[in-house]
């Protein structure tokens, strides 16, 4: 049973004689008269097992002591730490020729863990061990234990295990402790990459290249590598890992962003508080959800506050000029937290009797500078119909207006364009023709441009060619022209008048009076 003793993290103990409870039971040769297992008290009055030999009087000593089989555990180089005491030969009388102050350390590699005998010729010498300090009779009297510590290394090793042997050639020695260990670079985390326990290389100058693996919730930025030095120290970190989106580095690990925080990308940044008007309800958020009524545009960064559509523009003023309207307004009170505000104009033509019956104005209307995406707060609208009710809506829009299901962003004004002279009459018809009269009828102009006050009919004999004409005025859309000459060709023109003046005459209608009464339908061109 081995008691726990604390050694450096980069050393892995394969054998520690001081941690063994009970006898060590190593093999000695010769079996008697050489190395002896002796229990002594250490500095803390704890019993420890030692091996001692002190055949200083007799010549030609060759006493061997061999450990049990020691597993290699994959180590290619092992270290042997020996703590021992050694008697000063000068302090011993009459041993001048036979007393030695050194011993030899050997090893033998083997896959066999049950070798019963010491075969000296199998062992390879590691070194001759000498004491830095030897003790005298005076030290014994003062109970002073002058402990020497020597460390040797051996390698490269290749078999499953090995035996150590100590050869005494006539010294007075006590092996107080023997520890065999190898060195490793201990598991570590560097730059968010974990590097495993790594056994050092075979020789004292070798570097073992080790690839690290990114810790949980992280990813490689550059391949993480380190070198394990022969002394068990990690050297030259290269590359690193970065915490994934939604995670930040904390004490060498990648932890999920707290609730109310987020991290959008795999970077070395920390998590950030959710921007204004947004929140996260789970740990590890990569973005924050916008509050109700707030939105994030497609090209808005995750770090930007959530915003909302603007409120309606303010103070809409209209100025009607015949068939043009100039509109001006003020910016909305609330821009929704965005800078990308613009304005759209909606034009609707509405019936006079029922303003709710409105239709889009169509493509004939023109807007200066433009109808949509206005950056200024004014617009000029032209090519409207005269004497028509129009409703104009000014919509304030920004980058998130399209996400708003309940728009409330427009202000409107209804205007009536001024009256103008009406358009020409498209169709004049001769309904009845007699020898002395023609009954005419016509349609209202396409664009009355106001209230039609009256119609004016101009007619003349075709031969006179407008040198001598007569005028008839009527409020109705028909009239009887009497007192004509029979069998004579007449030309008729009709025009309408509003308060703004007369429109253009219609195309000429040519009619010839009959000898026999007849009903005909004219088409605004020649009729016979």
């Amino acid at each position: 049973v081995t008691g726990s003793r604390v050694y450096p993290a980069n050393e892995v103990t394969l054998l520690d004689s001081r941690s063994v409870q009970g006898e060590l039971g190593w093999i000695a040769s010769p079996l008697e008269g050489g190395w002896e297992e002796v229990s002594i008290m250490d500095e803390k009055n704890t019993p420890i097992r030692t091996y001692q030999v002190c055949n200083v009087m007799e010549p030609s000593q060759n006493n061997w002591l061999r450990t049990d089989w020691i597993t290699r555990e994959g180590a290619q180089r092992v270290y042997i730490e020996i703590k021992f005491t050694l008697r000063d030969c000068n302090s011993l009388p009459g041993v001048m020729g036979t007393c030695k102050e050194t011993f030899n350390l050997y090893y033998y590699e083997s896959d066999n863990d049950k070798e019963r005998f010491i075969r000296e010729n199998q062992f390879v010498k590691i070194d001759t061990i000498a004491a830095d300090e030897s003790f005298t009779q005076v030290d014994i009297g003062d109970r002073i234990m002058k402990l020497n510590t020597e460390i040797r290394d051996v390698g490269p090793l290749s078999k499953k295990g090995f035996y150590l042997a100590f050869q005494d050639v006539g010294a007075c020695i006590a092996l107080v402790s023997v520890r065999v260990f190898y060195k490793k670079c201990p598991l570590t985390v560097r730059n968010l990459a974990q590097f495993p326990d790594t056994i050092t290389g075979a020789d004292t100058s070798s570097l073992v290249e080790v690839r690290g693996s990114c810790v949980n919730n992280s990813e490689e930025k550059d391949v993480p590598k380190m070198y394990c030095g022969a002394d068990g120290e990690w050297l030259v970190p290269i590359g690193n890992c970065l915490c994934n989106a939604g995670h930040e580095e904390r004490s060498g690990e990648c932890q999920a962003c707290k609730i109310g925080y987020y991290k959008a990308l795999s970077t070395d940044a920390t998590c950030a508080k959710c921007p204004p008007h947004s929140y996260s309800v789970w740990e590890g958020a990569t973005s924050c959800t916008c509050d109700r009524g707030f939105f994030r545009a497609d090209n808005d960064a995750a770090s930007m506050p959530c915003t909302r559509p603007p409120s309606a523009p303010l103070n809409l003023i209209s100025n009607v000029n015949e068939t043009s309207v100039n509109l001006e307004w003020s910016s909305p009170q609330n821009t929704g937290g965005r800078q990308d505000i613009s304005y759209n104009v909606v034009c609707k033509k509405c019936g006079a009797g029922d303003p709710s019956k409105c239709r889009p104005c169509g493509s004939g209307v023109h807007y200066t500078p433009q109808q949509n995406g206005l950056k200024t707060t004014k617009v000029s609208i032209t090519d409207l119909l005269a004497h028509t009710n129009y409703t104009f809506e000014i919509w304030a829009v920004n980058g998130v207006s399209k996400y708003n299901p309940n728009p409330d962003q427009s202000v409107s004004v209804t205007v009536t364009t001024n009256q103008a002279a009406p358009s020409s009459i498209a169709l004049v018809q001769a309904k009845e023709v007699t020898r002395y009269s023609v009954a005419l009828a016509w349609l209202e102009p396409d664009r009355p441009n106001g209230v039609i006050l009256e119609y004016e009919v101009k007619y003349y004999e075709k031969d006179q060619n407008e040198r001598s004409y007569r005028i008839v005025r009527t409020a109705a859309r028909n009239t009887d022209i009497k007192g004509l000459n029979p069998l004579t060709s007449y030309v008729f023109h009709v025009r309408a008048r509003t308060a703004a003046g007369y429109g253009d005459f219609s195309e000429p209608l040519e009619v010839t009076t009959n000898t026999v009464p007849s009903r005909i339908i004219g088409d605004g061109a020649n009729s016979t």
Partner: antibody, heavy 114, light 109 residues
Framework: SLEESGGRLVTPGTPLTLTCTVS????????MSWVRQAPGKGLEWIGI?????NTYYANWAKGRFTISKTSTTVDLKITSPTTEDTATYFC????????????WGPGTLVTVSS | AIKMTQTPSSVSAAVGGTVTINCQAS????????LAWYQQKPGQPPKLLIY???SLASGVPSRFKGSGSGTEFTLTISDLECADAATYYC?????????FGGGTEVVVK
């Protein structure tokens, strides 16, 4: 809730382990800190055990304290107490919504005296 | 580690009055606002009052107000009540470390 135990009179150098017993939430979901307060003095943060099981200590506390946990308890081991370690020791839960402690135990008193 | 300096160490005010406690960090706290305020009465553990510099903890009266960001923070207690007599601590977080301020004792007359 949190409940500390294990506080008592110890002699200098005698290791002591305090235990914080957790109920009503899971240690796999929260990081846990230990804080101490010497008599008549201010609060002093010792260290934290993350839900992953990894630990982090204040600079002054490294090597002097060890934090560990089971599924329902968090332990603080004072490795070699000195008289300066006489204090009330609190365990506290780190919030999941801000950096700070949102739940505290009542504390347990440790007295180190020869 | 971040260092939190709390001033004053003691303050006295009458019932109904107002006290202001300052906390200065040696460097900007995490996110510029990861600072909490705690109230502690003798024989009791600390009680959370304010988190992330200005958010009021659940069940805490609105008489307690936190403000500040970066390195300068303030706790203001208005309409003082006898029950507010206690020691108040700020707690800052930065780079894995928590640090408490030295504490301010509030005496209510």
């Amino acid at each position: 809730s949190l409940e500390e135990s294990g506080g008592r009179l110890v002699t200098p150098g005698t290791p002591l382990t305090l235990t914080c017993t957790v109920s009503g939430f899971s240690l796999s979901s929260y990081h846990m800190s230990w804080v101490r307060q010497a008599p008549g003095k201010g609060l002093e943060w010792i260290g934290i055990i993350y839900r992953s099981g990894n630990t982090y200590y204040a600079n002054w506390a490294k090597g002097r304290f060890t934090i560990s946990k089971t599924s329902t308890t968090v332990d603080l081991k004072i490795t070699s107490p000195t008289t300066e370690d006489t204090a009330t020791y609190f365990c506290a839960r780190e919030s999941s919504t801000f950096y700070g402690m949102d739940l505290w135990g009542p504390g347990t008193l440790v007295t180190v005296s020869s | 580690a971040i260092k939190m300096t709390q001033t004053p160490s003691s303050v006295s005010a009458a019932v109904g009055g107002t006290v202001t406690i300052n906390c200065q960090a040696s460097q900007s706290v995490y996110g510029n606002n990861e600072l909490a305020w705690y109230q502690q009465k003798p024989g009791q553990p600390p009680k959370l009052l304010i988190y992330t510099a200005s958010s009021l903890a659940s069940g805490v009266p609105s008489r307690f107000k936190g403000s500040g960001s970066g390195t300068e923070f303030t706790l203001t207690i208005s309409d003082l009540e006898c029950a507010d007599a206690a020691t108040y601590y700020c707690l800052g977080y930065k780079s894995d470390d928590y640090t408490f301020g030295g504490g301010t004792e509030v005496v209510v007359k």
